[in-house]
């Protein structure tokens, strides 16, 4: 008789990341009997929902169910039917919805209400949809990357199983860049965290962590651009804005109403003598960099040290994983290699931004123009944010690792969120049970 394989004793979890520009659904899988082990949960699927972020559905709220259908049906296919009822589903909304809530709590609630009703119709164990705080977004991103890097494991290994892993158990800091906010999270070296709002205390696998985190709302790459435009149009002499952050020859007409519809530009709002203006790219990295720096108020700091806008930031410590848009933008620009120095990155950005728009379109014919036009600004913004905003230097640049995935799982807040909500990160180190780990014979 043939040996029949025993049914896999596995569990699944689903997290939807409702970001400012789009929604992604992640499916995670882990062995049921190793729930409390570190590093056993891994991503088996990512499904990007077609369409914009949920905050854009205020005028079409009843379509949210349809919007989520394809990815939820994909989850139904990937996860065995016998597991559906015990598979938790979580949706976390980030800065796009934080901004909508600032404009109208009622509209934000209505969007979330429809999301909840839609997700409740599936055979999974729906656990709720909510707007997560910036502090949570930072913390869960930090948990995700350190969990995947094996930093919470108490077993020291003589070999490395994951990239960037050194034998020490020092955690990595987390740098997350979205469309509407950016987060910085790390364990400072023996430094008191001077502002309570930025302090987190964790006990994970028997070890205490004092973590610094801050989320800068309106400083994601998309909202930062709108801020910059709103700032620059104030001093424009007419409806032409010559912009160094776009390639020479690039032109784009912008509606003033679009510029002022986000709360992020409120501080720059003024009555303009025109309804539209035209951006004309001049492609100058240095001038673009200077313009971006004007978004960071560094003149005021009530602490021993600040990032910008009066926000406390301790001295940087250790290695950092930079993910989400930090990674996507730098990957496009071919600047994610560990060997590329900060000076080289700056040099490459200068060359890239100076390339004529027609030339860029030819070189990257397969890329949608709406995305292609953004990389000069986004790359320059990343450099400005990391160097002037967070005080990385040419020397400490080598401690930044641009990370897309670790061991096949996306770097981001979703895995940490699920690990926390399913109580899969114990406070104490679990006792090893016989044969729960592979043994050498």
């Amino acid at each position: 008789t043939q040996n029949k394989a025993l049914p896999e004793n596995v569990k699944y979890g689903i997290v939807l990341d409702a970001g400012s520009s789009h929604t992604s659904l992640y499916i995670y899988k882990w062995p049921a009997e190793k729930e409390n082990d570190t590093g056993v949960v891994h991503q088996v699927e990512e499904c990007r929902v077609k369409g914009p972020g949920i905050s854009k559905f205020v005028q079409k709220v009843n379509e949210i169910g349809i919007y989520l259908t394809d990815c939820m049906e994909r989850a139904r296919e990937v996860i065995p039917r016998s597991q559906h009822q015990e598979t938790p589903v979580y949706l976390g909304a980030t800065a796009g919805m934080r901004l909508l809530r600032m404009e109208s709590e009622e509209l934000a609630d209505r969007v979330l209400d429809v999301v909840e009703r839609s997700l409740s119709n599936y055979p999974f164990d729906f656990q709720g949809a909510r707007i997560i705080t910036g502090q949570e977004e930072g913390a869960y991103g930090w948990i995700t990357i350190n969990y995947l890097l094996g930093k919470f494991s108490q077993k020291t290994r003589w070999f490395s199983i994951v990239p960037y892993e050194t034998n020490n158990q020092e955690t990595f800091g987390a740098l997350d860049l979205g469309g509407a906010s950016t987060q910085v999270t790390f364990v400072p070296q023996n430094q008191t965290i001077e502002s309570p709002d930025n302090a987190l205390q964790f006990r994970l696998y028997g070890k205490d962590y004092n973590v610094y985190t801050h989320s800068f709302l309106c400083y994601g790459k998309d909202q930062a651009l709108w801020q910059k435009l709103a700032k620059d149009i104030q001093v424009a002499s007419n409806e032409i804005l010559r912009d160094p952050c776009f390639h020479p020859g690039y032109k784009k007409v912008v509606n003033v109403s679009d510029l002022y519809k986000t709360p992020c530009t409120k501080r720059f709002e003024m009555t303009l003598p025109f309804q539209q203006f035209e951006i004309q790219g001049i492609g100058n990295y240095q001038q673009c960099h200077q313009s971006i720096l004007e978004l960071f108020n560094t003149s005021y700091c009530p602490y021993s040290q600040c990032a910008f806008n009066g926000i406390f930031l301790p001295p940087l410590q250790g290695d950092f994983g930079a993910f989400s848009a930090f990674y996507f933008v730098m990957k496009f620009l071919n600047l994610t290699s560990e060997k590329v120095s900060q000076e080289k990155v700056t040099e490459m950005m200068k060359k890239f931004c100076a390339q004529p728009w027609e030339e860029i379109k030819t070189s990257y014919a397969g890329v949608k123009e709406k995305y292609l036009s953004e990389y000069c600004f986004s790359g320059t913004y990343i450099l400005s944010l990391l160097l002037q905003g967070y005080h990385f230097t040419a020397d400490s640049w080598e401690h930044i690792h641009f990370i897309g995935k670790i061991q096949g799982s996306d770097a981001g807040w979703t895995l940490g969120y699920m690990l926390n909500l399913t109580n899969m990160i114990p406070a104490e180190q679990p006792l090893s049970t016989p044969l729960s780990h592979s043994t050498y014979v």
Partner: nanobody, 124 residues
Framework: QVQLVESGGGLVQPGGSLRLSCAAS????????MGWYRQAPGKERELVAA???????NLADSTKGRFTISRDNTKNTVYLQMNSLKPEDTAVYYC??????????????????WGQGTQVTVSS
């Protein structure tokens, strides 16, 4: 931009059938879903049926079991097959398509396109 052209409306007796068509042209790669809405005199516009880019369908409770929505990708056309029609199905039927706005920039906006509408009258 996306252009939507509807056809197939008309007068039909109760219990009869009609098939509406909606042909899409333009930058359709960004479309996430297409569907049909209807508006009866003095009433609000309501969703009848929708089909996603992945082929999943969604029908209003009032039309389940009677109406079906389908699409032909080669013709970029969506169909609404309406059977067992009732007088209360009388309305102007509008084709709708929505998705990512390709002209939006630094943050994705929702694009929302509508056809001109086609009259469906169910009467004996």
């Amino acid at each position: 931009q996306v252009q939507l052209v509807e056809s197939g409306g008309g007068l039909v007796q109760p219990g009869g059938s009609l098939r509406l068509s909606c042909a899409a042209s333009g930058s359709i790669s960004s479309i996430a879903a297409m569907g049909w809405y209807r508006q009866a005199p003095g009433k609000e516009r309501e969703l009848v049926a929708a089909i996603t880019s992945g082929g999943n369908t969604n029908l209003a409770d009032s039309t389940k079991g009677r109406f079906t929505i389908s699409r032909d990708n080669t013709k970029n056309t969506v169909y609404l097959q309406m059977n067992s029609l009732k007088p209360e199905d009388t309305a102007v039927y509008y084709c709708n398509a929505w998705g990512e706005d390709d002209s939006s920039w630094f943050g994705t906006d929702l694009c929302d396109y509508w056809g001109q509408g086609t009259q469906v009258t169910v009467s004996s």
